[in-house]
Interface confidence: low
């Protein structure tokens, strides 16, 4: 067959859908690979062809669009399952072509099972809510295009395994779930089940997302350097190991990049001709406030190193701070016979 621009298997689109539920999958060609949309392609005389490779098979097969009740159908650039079956899992290819042009892409589709508490291998999106911040909402995701606006579906919300009704601070409002005030106890998986009629049949869409309650911006502060501080002096003799921790607390800030770094004599450690290693560890609180520790280590410190300036720096979207460590050379203990005798005026 003639050459076709093959975009390969688009693993970025790892599509997961629930068994026995409707699924509508758009051909990725028009979303990610081509510079024109389906309408343009269609009016230019290009045809969209679908085929698939079953799980654990190498054979490309046509998709059977003649199943009872049109279980699988194509509408414009969308492949429809009404509903999916477990053995629909496989790699699906959409190919756009005419006599002179051909472009195709494949993508994996995984049909997954859920248990009666909505547990499944599905990768869940995470929605972050600010703690004690006032009313915040989550919206039942990815349900657009399944039914016309004239159809009024019923929506039931669950937290974990339980239907949300009479919760103190969580109120279902159709496609939205309102948190009057979010607490740590609201962390968990929330599921909306959308039920709608179509051609005498009833379909269910199940969408689960993880809610994570995080620090509120109204409580956010610039980075706080806990160490080094004024109470600790790093006193070393030449030849000893110098270890200085820089411990910084960062309030949670959405999409903020938290940075910690050391400077030695105003330069980055890499730009100084000494053998410095820096090890970093990161921990998070339940509200995703972050504590970063960077330990600066010089295995065998010299008297020259002990005269340098060691400064810990930190930066977040809230601001930048710096703190110098107090580093000193330890004064050797006096030798009695010489220094002490001289001190007493012995001759």
């Amino acid at each position: 067959s003639e050459r076709c621009d093959d975009w390969g298997l688009d693993t970025m689109r790892q599509i997961q859908v629930f068994e026995d539920e409707p699924a509508r999958i758009k051909c990725p060609l028009f979303e990610h690979f081509l510079k024109f949309n389906y309408s343009t392609a269609h009016s230019a005389g290009l045809t969209l062809i679908w085929y698939w490779t079953r799980q654990d098979r190498d054979l490309e097969e046509p998709i059977n669009f003649r199943l009872p009740e049109n279980r699988i159908s194509k509408e414009k650039d969308v492949l429809w399952f009404r509903p999916t079956l477990l053995n629909d899992t496989g790699n699906y290819t959409c190919m756009l072509r005419n006599t002179t042009y051909c472009s195709k892409v494949a993508f994996p589709l995984e049909v997954v099972q859920k248990d009666s508490c909505f547990n499944s291998p599905m990768k869940l999106p995470v929605h972050k809510l600010y703690i004690e911040y006032g009313i915040q909402r989550i919206t039942c995701p990815n349900v657009d295009g399944y039914f016309p606006s004239s159809v009024k579906p019923t929506i039931t919300w669950y937290m974990g395994c339980y239907k949300i009704q009479n919760f103190n601070n969580v109120i279902p409002e159709g496609m939205n779930l309102s948190f009057l005030i979010a607490f740590i106890s609201n962390n968990g998986n929330y599921t909306c089940v959308v039920t709608y009629p179509e051609n005498g049949r009833t379909f269910h869409l199940t969408r689960t997302l993880t809610v994570k309650v995080v620090g509120s911006p109204k409580n956010a502060v610039p980075p706080v350097i806990h160490s080094p501080n004024d109470h600790v002096v790093y006193e070393k003799e030449p030849g000893e190991e110098l270890l200085i921790p820089c411990t910084v607390y960062f309030s949670f800030l959405m999409d903020s990049r938290n940075e910690v770094w050391w400077t030695i004599d105003g330069k980055k450690p890499d730009d100084i001709p000494i053998d410095v290693t820096i090890n970093e560890s990161i921990s998070h609180s339940r509200t995703e406030d972050e504590t970063r520790t960077q330990i600066l280590s010089i295995k065998k410190v010299t008297s020259e190193d002990l005269k340098r300036s060691y400064v810990c720096h930190a930066r977040s979207a809230k601001g930048e701070v710096a703190k110098a460590a107090t580093v000193k050379q330890k004064v050797p203990a006096p030798r009695y016979t010489v220094e002490l005798a001289c001190g007493f005026g012995a001759t």
Epitope: S116, F118, Y158, C161, Y162, K163, N169, F183, S185
Partner: antibody
Framework: QVQLQESGPGLVKPSETLSLTCTVS????????WNWIRQPPVKGLEWIGY???????NYNPSLKSRVTMSVDTSKNQFSLKLSSVTAADTAVYYC???????????WGQGTLVTVSS | QSVLTQPPSASGTPGQRVTISCSGS????????VNWYQLLPGTAPKLLIY???QRPSGVPDRFSGSKSGTSASLAISGLQSEDEADYYC???????????FGGGTKLTVL
């Protein structure tokens, strides 16, 4: 394997308060509703009410004025208090977890509480 | 007087099929799902059927549930002596804003 166990006195005097605790083992009190149900001798099941992990409650309207439920997430326990009891409150009291689809999927063994002077 | 109405008793011989009915109204069975529970003497109640006809794992397929309008029923086929128990239907009631049970049906295996 989640298990529920009721505990509390088996004998309560009339006009006093009946107090029961249900301990959840093998699981957490989060994400479910925790119910109390009773069965008087030779009668049917009667729903008393439920509580969720955040303290949200819903009580049977016929018992509402006398019922108080509480939850202790640190101990994985929830409790029932029924005030001003009479002989009509003599029953086997069950605690039950309400899972998905509004169903009591896990029950305690039940504890008999007799109201008598 | 229970909100959901069940026959007080039912009986059948081993191997037979018996049906237990549960009648309600638009505010309970009519608009919510029905569950069925089995109470064997001296044991904790057991969930038999949820969401009108779903069986939890471990419940034999001899037990089946159905719902139509404001009524529901539990059918037990291939009746066995160990099925002798009390059976209760239950549903949420929107008007009462609470859970309601049927009065229970005592099943005797003759």
């Amino acid at each position: 394997q989640v298990q529920l166990q009721e505990s509390g006195p088996g004998l309560v005097k009339p006009s006093e308060t009946l107090s029961l605790t249900c301990t959840v083992s093998g699981g957490s009190v989060f994400s479910y509703f925790w119910n109390w149900i009773r069965q008087p001798p030779v009668k049917g099941l009667e729903w008393i009410g439920y509580i969720d992990h955040s303290g949200g409650t819903n009580y049977n309207p016929s018992l509402k004025s006398r019922v108080t439920m509480s939850v202790d997430t640190s101990k994985n326990q929830f409790s029932l208090k029924l005030s001003s009891v009479t002989a009509a409150d003599t029953a086997v009291y069950y605690c039950a977890r309400e899972g998905l689809h509004d169903a009591f999927d896990i029950w305690g063994q039940g504890t008999l509480v007799t109201v008598s002077s | 007087q229970s909100v959901l109405t069940q026959p007080p008793s039912a009986s059948g011989t081993p191997g037979q099929r018996v049906t237990i009915s549960c009648s309600g109204s638009s505010s309970n069975i009519g608009s919510n799902t029905v569950n069925w529970y089995q109470l064997l003497p001296g044991t904790a109640p057991k969930l038999l059927i949820y969401s009108n006809y779903q069986r939890p794992s471990g419940v034999p397929d001899r037990f089946s549930g159905s719902k139509s309008g404001t009524s529901a029923s539990l059918a037990i086929s291939g009746l066995q002596s160990e099925d002798e128990a009390d059976y209760y239907c239950a549903a949420w009631d929107d008007s009462l804003n609470g859970r309601v049970f049927g009065g229970g049906t005592k099943l005797t295996v003759l």
